[in-house]
Amino acid sequence: MAVTACQGLGFVVSLIGIAGIIAATCMDQWSTQDLYNNPVTAVFNYQGLWRSCVRESSGFTECRGYFTLLGLPAMLQAVRALMIVGIVLGAIGLLVSIFALKCIRIGSMEDSAKANMTLTSGIMFIVSGLCAIAGVSVFANMLVTNFWMSTANMYTGMGGMVQTVQTRYTFGAALFVGWVAGGLTLIGGVMMCIACRGLAPEETNYKAVSYHASGHSVAYKPGGFKASTGFGSNTKNKKIYDGGARTEDEVQSYPSKHDYV
């Protein structure tokens, strides 16, 4: 039961995370004009990964796409790439995890296959979340660098009669959405991996070989990878004797105790 809950929750958390990554990638507010002491501005600039926008106090908003690939900074291209990779991996992970969910029955798919799919989707979510966090962090670092550079420029070359209003940019809402979404996707991925570990012992059990001691008709199950190292006896960590003579087929048909932890 706990495995199903962990898997389901991991799926939902990752779904929210990936939706957030998509939202962040599409948002225009990756960087917003720093208003420092003036909360009201006649012209407000903000930029996204795909276009830059200007909102006038008149309410008029104009956005212009970046219609060049070669003319864009390499860092911006890298951030775009990281976010897209994150979305693609996350989307594939979601697709895989749907079929891996314990609560969904698809034909005669074995739990071992579901465990593998759960682990695969979990890893995909982890990588997806890391890509998003990396992308947002790279952009944030770029902003911080540019912010201090433009701040330095504001206080140099002021000797002349004409001053240039230097537009400084600070963190936009998309950065925070991206960080949170990346984190959620990462957490969801970890939960999927934990759920996989809960599923996996049973798979090894099902493939166990029955050892028949002389004069007894008792089946012994060697401990799974979760409970033991796989070497020697396993009396300390896991009860391996079921207390009744059952065949492998019978053992397989009973519900796993891991479902009710």
Partner: antibody, heavy 118, light 113 residues
């Protein structure tokens, strides 16, 4: 047709207060910032401040903080500017104006002359 | 605050001739975000409120005759009337529309020679 109709001329004594009105018609009142500008005799135009009829938020020129107070009556599509502690230097024509694209004023009231004289 | 200085203070031009009014800003009015210059030109006739002629330094307001044109970028701007008409006699103002507080030039009085 967009129209901004202001209240009539006022003559006030120094230290008194005056409230000028600006009634808007022909457009959605709550969609545009309303600005106030003054023109003293022989002086350049001076921006006083602005108010958004939807949110009621205001922004003033530092020079007019404490001097001008902008309010509105949404139901009557009317903006008001109250000038307090009047002095002879406040003698001017006061305009309300609607802000449009390019942060420019496309429609202006006809102007209200405020004369401060003892 | 941004200071706008117009030149000349007054200008006399013959009918049908070109009239040029300059406006210089103490700070750049060019917005890097959209590469637009936030300078506006107004015409004011005696006893009337100002009338919008040009915004974004060069965009003519609808209904304004095409003999009026605006140019310039950054800190230096020009209003040109290609062929002066009698009805163009007025005072012309430039306005900073880039930062608050909005500021205006001192005005240029245009007369017929």
């Amino acid at each position: 047709e967009v129209q901004l109709v202001q209240s009539g001329a006022e003559v006030k004594k120094p230290g008194a207060s005056v409230k000028v009105s600006c009634k808007a018609s022909g457009y959605t009142f709550t969609s545009y910032w309303m600005h106030w500008v003054r023109q003293a005799p022989g002086q350049r135009l001076e921006w006083i401040g602005m108010i958004h009829p939807n949110s009621g938020s205001t922004n003033y020129n530092e020079k007019f903080k404490g001097k001008a107070t902008l309010t509105l009556d949404k139901s009557a599509s009317t903006a008001y500017m109250e000038l307090s502690s009047l002095r002879s230097e406040d003698t001017a024509v006061y305009y309300c104006a609607r802000l449009k694209t390019g942060n420019s004023f496309d429609y202006w009231g006809q102007g209200t002359t405020v004369t401060v004289s003892s | 605050d941004i200071v706008l200085t117009q030149s000349p203070d007054s200008l006399a031009v013959s009918l049908g001739e070109r009239a040029t009014i300059n406006c210089k800003s103490s700070q750049s009015l060019l917005n890097s975000g959209n590469q637009k210059n936030y300078l506006t030109w107004y015409q004011q006739k005696p006893g009337q409120p100002p009338k919008l002629l040009i915004y974004w330094a060069s965009t003519r307001e609808s209904g304004v005759p095409d003999r009026f044109s605006g140019s310039g970028s950054g800190t230096d701007f020009t209003l040109t009337i290609s062929s002066l008409q009698a009805e163009d006699v007025a005072v012309y103002y430039c306005q900073n529309a880039y930062t608050y507080p909005f500021t205006f030039g001192q005005g240029t009085k245009l007369e017929i020679k």
